[in-house]
């Protein structure tokens, strides 16, 4: 009922609560004196549902047979109409449809650590839109019972509150759960079990990590566990990676020893544990434990590159570069390279600690067989050295590589391909392609980079600090025993149209004709390898096409000479570049009036 | 146990606008329906307005396309928002939650609508 109803009563027969899918008879019924004033069968009593008409009836009470109602709960409220007012609310009453409770399924209980509570869960089944009631009981040995009630709508959880204790470890223990609502009950399967079958540890805590004598081969992990812990699984991985390496250990107490770990590498470790070989449940995983393994002596060695350079008559320029060492291979934080230059008749040795740098320059006399050793050093000790002779890496032109070229390979990558060279190519023992940023006047200061190359491969794609729209000097030297040969080419992984022409910056008259001298187009603007220049020329106020002349580019150059001019006939000229993808725009404009002779 | 607590009421001229809230304690909230109604001095407590859990709402005649009735069942809160109001809305306005158990009410707010 919806309250006091003062003017009439609304009933609901069999039930206010119906089980979905059943009918209902609903009946209104005025309460004496309590219908139109004048004349009762004036009345028309109306049943709504919810803000819906679906009945009326004129006189004293109304019957109405109602089917289809869904899930939930529906008001039906009666109205009374009489001529010339409004329709006046007599009663109103809500049905509430619903489903008796499915079984519940699944029913497990835990007790989280020795000194834990019993807690179970169950899955409810389908909603059944009534208040459902859910009732778990334990029972025990000795006829031992524990009941508790869930008032929660969504109840599928209780926790006894109750601690099992390991003094009779097989006893068994069982569990149900009991829903009720107005439409029915169900219970569940019971659930059995021994206090073994129910306590998941704790997960272990206090982790520690201890390397004996620094070293990651001596590495134990200890840590802490309930008493009655028998079982642990143990889990590590680099921190950078996603793979966990599991181990399984029995009776361990606490701790045990790693033997596969890499130096100098932070790992993650946890920790699981469990109470019996095949009963109970793993304990969640542990808190994380980070820590670093110590650093082992580097293995591997330095890949080592030189480059050579004439100073004068007596003396040359001698550039080492190398690739650190890969993280595996390092073992530690390299605190210093270790570069030993060796003159192998005198027996003259020179060492000398780099650090914060991967080269080294030094000024050497152009007599003598110098050799160099490069080794990494960290904490622990130093890589093998690799030792190179210092060679003249162009002299041998019989072992140069045959018709090399530079190629674009998709974004930031050359394919630089070659031939093997003309003398015995098996005599090759590796080839060695070589890059770095062309820059006018040949700056030594431009980063170097290098990869090596098997001796049967002839092509290598370097990807390796390559900038789109930049040229790039490329060198490909085959290597055999103490002799080099090489070959060079320029390169570009992308190009387009030089942003700017060169600028002229004089004109100077020679025996009738003229000499041009430019300004290197800035690098930023050459927007890759520049294949030629073009020199213009036209009379001045005519509008005859100009003339031009093409020159190959060369790096060092920057001035022409032109003999094609008329004497006192002033000329305009200027000069653009061109790549392979196009011409550049003008560079600037210059006046100039051959003094000379006519020829 | 189920408790509700309406708030918002007041004094509103003619024409004015009021924002009833009702909030309920317990957990039943999300599977039933809650109403509003009204009791004018005199007269007896007539229903205004439902909303089922899944947020369908349904008006009596007098309130219809004046009034507004929604829920947040995260705050377990229910609302009437009253535009247009008259005088004939004058009463002690009161949640509801039904329940086949029996029905939960509010303690009521006055609704006073005059010049």
């Known amino acids: 009922k919806i309250d006091a109803c003062k003017r009439g009563d609304v009933t609901v027969k069999p039930s206010h609560v119906i089980l979905l899918g059943s009918t209902v008879n609903i009946t209104c019924s005025l309460k004496p004196r309590q219908g139109c004033f004048h004349y009762s069968r004036r009345n028309k009593l109306i049943l709504y549902k919810f803000d819906r008409r679906i009945n009326f009836h004129h006189g004293h009470s109304l019957n109405s047979q109602v089917t289809g109602l869904p899930l939930g709960t529906t008001l039906f409220v009666c109205k009374l109409a009489c001529i010339n007012s409004d329709e006046i609310q007599i009663c109103g009453a809500e049905i509430f449809v619903g489903v008796a409770p499915e079984q519940p399924q699944n029913l497990s209980c835990i007790q989280k650590g020795e000194q834990g509570t019993v807690a179970c869960t169950w899955e409810r089944g389908r909603d059944t839109h009534l208040y459902t009631e859910y009732t778990l009981q334990l029972s025990g040995p000795k006829n031992l019972t524990w009941q508790k009630q869930c008032k929660d709508i969504y109840c599928d959880y209780l926790d006894f509150g109750i601690n099992l204790t390991p003094e009779s470890p097989e006893s068994n223990f069982t569990a149900k759960v009991t829903a009720v609502n107005s439409l029915g009950s169900s219970s569940s399967l019971p659930s059995t079990f021994t206090f073994l079958d129910i306590v998941r540890p704790l997960p272990p805590w206090d982790i520690r990590i201890k390397f004996q004598k620094a070293s990651v081969s001596r590495c134990t992990l200890y840590w802490r566990d309930e008493g009655l812990v028998l079982l642990n699984r143990l889990r590590y991985r680099p921190s950078n990676s996603r793979l966990w390496n599991m181990v399984n250990v029995t009776k361990a107490k606490g701790r045990h020893d790693l033997l596969d770990l890499k130096p100098f590498t932070e790992y993650e470790f946890q920790i699981s544990s469990k109470l019996h070989l095949y009963k109970g449940s793993w304990s969640d995983w542990s808190e994380s434990l980070r820590a670093q393994t110590p650093e082992e002596e580097p293995t591997g060695m330095l890949d080592v590159w030189y480059m050579k350079r004439h100073i004068d008559y007596s003396r040359q320029q001698i550039s080492l570069f190398w690739k650190n060492l890969s993280v595996s291979e390092a073992r530690g934080k390299i605190l210093h390279y270790q570069v030993t230059l060796q003159e192998l008749t005198g027996g003259k040795a020179m060492t000398q600690n780099i650090t914060g740098h991967t080269s080294w320059t030094t000024v050497i006399p152009r007599t003598g067989n110098w050799a160099v050793a490069v080794s990494a050093a960290n904490s622990k000790g130093s890589s093998l050295p690799t030792r190179i002779n210092i060679m003249n890496l162009c002299e041998a032109g019989l072992l140069a590589p045959r018709q090399v070229s530079a190629n674009s390979e998709g974004m930031d990558n050359i394919l630089v391909t070659w031939q093997p060279p003309r003398k015995d190519p098996s005599a090759v023992q590796e080839y060695v392609v070589e890059w770095r940023e062309l820059h006018p006047g040949g700056d030594t200061q431009v980063p170097l980079n290098w990869l090596r190359s098997r001796p049967y491969n002839v092509s290598a794609l370097i990807s390796e600090n390559i900038k789109s729209y930049i040229c790039y000097e490329i060198r490909v030297y085959a290597l055999s025993g103490d002799q080099g040969g090489c070959s060079s080419i320029l390169g570009n992984s992308k190009h387009k149209a030089p942003l700017s022409g060169p600028h002229i910056n004089a004109i100077t008259e020679e025996k009738g004709s003229i000499l041009i001298s430019w300004n290197s187009i800035p690098v930023q603007e050459q927007m890759g390898c520049l294949l030629h220049y073009r020199i213009y020329w036209k009379e001045r106020d005519s509008n005859s096409q100009p003339q031009l002349c093409e020159i190959p580019y060369r790096v060092s150059q920057n001035s022409h000479p032109i003999n094609s001019l008329q004497p006192r006939v002033t000329y305009v000229l200027w000069m653009t570049a061109l790549t392979a993808a196009g011409e550049s725009s003008h560079g600037n404009e210059r006046e100039f009036c051959l003094q000379g002779k006519a020829n | 146990q189920v408790q509700l607590q309406e708030s918002g009421g007041g004094l509103v001229q003619p024409g004015g606008s009021l924002r009833l809230s009702c909030t309920a304690s317990?957990?039943?909230?999300?599977?039933?329906?809650m109403d509003w109604y009204r009791q004018a001095p005199g007269n007896q407590r007539e229903w205004v307005a439902s909303?089922?859990?899944?947020?369908?709402?349904y008006y009596d005649d007098s309130a219809k396309g004046r009034f507004t009735i929604s829920r947040d069942n995260a705050k377990m809160t229910v609302y009437l928002q009253m535009n247009s109001l008259k005088p004939e809305d004058t009463a002690v306005y009161y949640c509801?939650?039904?329940?086949?158990?029996?029905?939960?009410w509010g303690q009521g707010t006055q609704v006073t609508v005059s010049s």
């Open positions: 317990g957990s039943i909230f999300s599977i039933y329906n």
């Open positions: 509801k939650v039904p329940t086949e158990k029996g029905n939960y």
């Open positions: 909303i089922t859990p899944s947020g369908d709402p």
